[in-house]
Amino acid sequence: LVPHLGDREKRDSVCPQGKYIHPQNNSICCTKCHKGTYLYNDCPGPGQDTDCRECESGSFTASENHLRHCLSCSKCRKEMGQVEISSCTVDRDTVCGCRKNQYRHYWSENLFQCFNCSLCLNGTVHLSCQEKQNTVCTCHAGFFLRENECVSCSNCKKSLECTKLCLPQIENVKGTEDSGTT
């Protein structure tokens, strides 16, 4: 089976690697622009240079290309707790990340938010906090896990999942209610 190729891929595959087919003359292969530059003018003829210009401040290209414009640099989203790990350069986009003792929670493929790693108070660390995953906690007796925090069984209502973990405490609460003590 031949993979389906888009028009641009089809045109590029006619030329050797590092070259692209001239958009107005498919008998000419022009040299692609280096990363950090963009295509200003196609090469006028075979063996002649492509006119590539360096990306302006605030834009970049990270690989060889024949783009008419450089790509805009990403901005780190402060309101998501992101910090700039490295600034944008002509050949590399901004790199955003989280502070120490924080992890990335991905809301979608490219949008992440920084949250503090759980400290496992009233529990123990089962798995340490990682770049893209919060600490996994195991709670001490008398506590249950709710949204990755160890919460006292006194906060466990009968209708909740925690009843299995907090069964003795729940029974005690039920017993005191039944006996009518205040």
Epitope: K75, W107, S108, N110, L111, E147
Partner: nanobody, 119 residues
């Protein structure tokens, strides 16, 4: 473009409650996580709370944990922020956002809704 309309803000006494709503005009609302943010005068916009597409997971800023509750109604394309035990430091303009890179534009925010907590 996604249209977000926040409402429910107002003036409230410290210790009082307020419920904010955010109506989103996006066909696939139930596919996206939603968030609330706020901005006080002279301060940067900050995260308040977020909720997953299903409503199964919620996240809160430490400053509002135990006081604020985020919820959603996918049938109504609406996300809510129930704010209890309000403090003067909660005074800000509150904004909601779709938490997805295709829809959540860095420079796009709704008009927001003003919340003022008096002591």
């Amino acid at each position: 473009q996604v249209q977000l309309q926040e409402s429910g803000g107002g003036l409230v006494q410290a210790g009082g409650p307020l419920r904010l709503s955010c109506a989103a005009s996006v066909r696939t609302f139930s596919s996206y996580a939603m968030g609330w943010f706020r901005q006080a005068p002279g301060k940067e916009r900050e995260f308040v709370a977020a909720i997953s597409w299903s409503g199964g997971s919620t996240y809160y800023a430490d400053s509002v944990k135990g006081r604020f509750t985020i919820s959603r109604d996918n049938a109504k394309n609406t996300v809510y922020l129930q704010m209890n035990s309000l403090k003067p430091e909660d005074t800000a303009v509150y904004y909601c956002a779709v938490l997805h890179e295709d829809l959540y534009e860095y420079d796009y925010w709704g008009q927001g809704t003003q919340v003022t907590v008096s002591s």
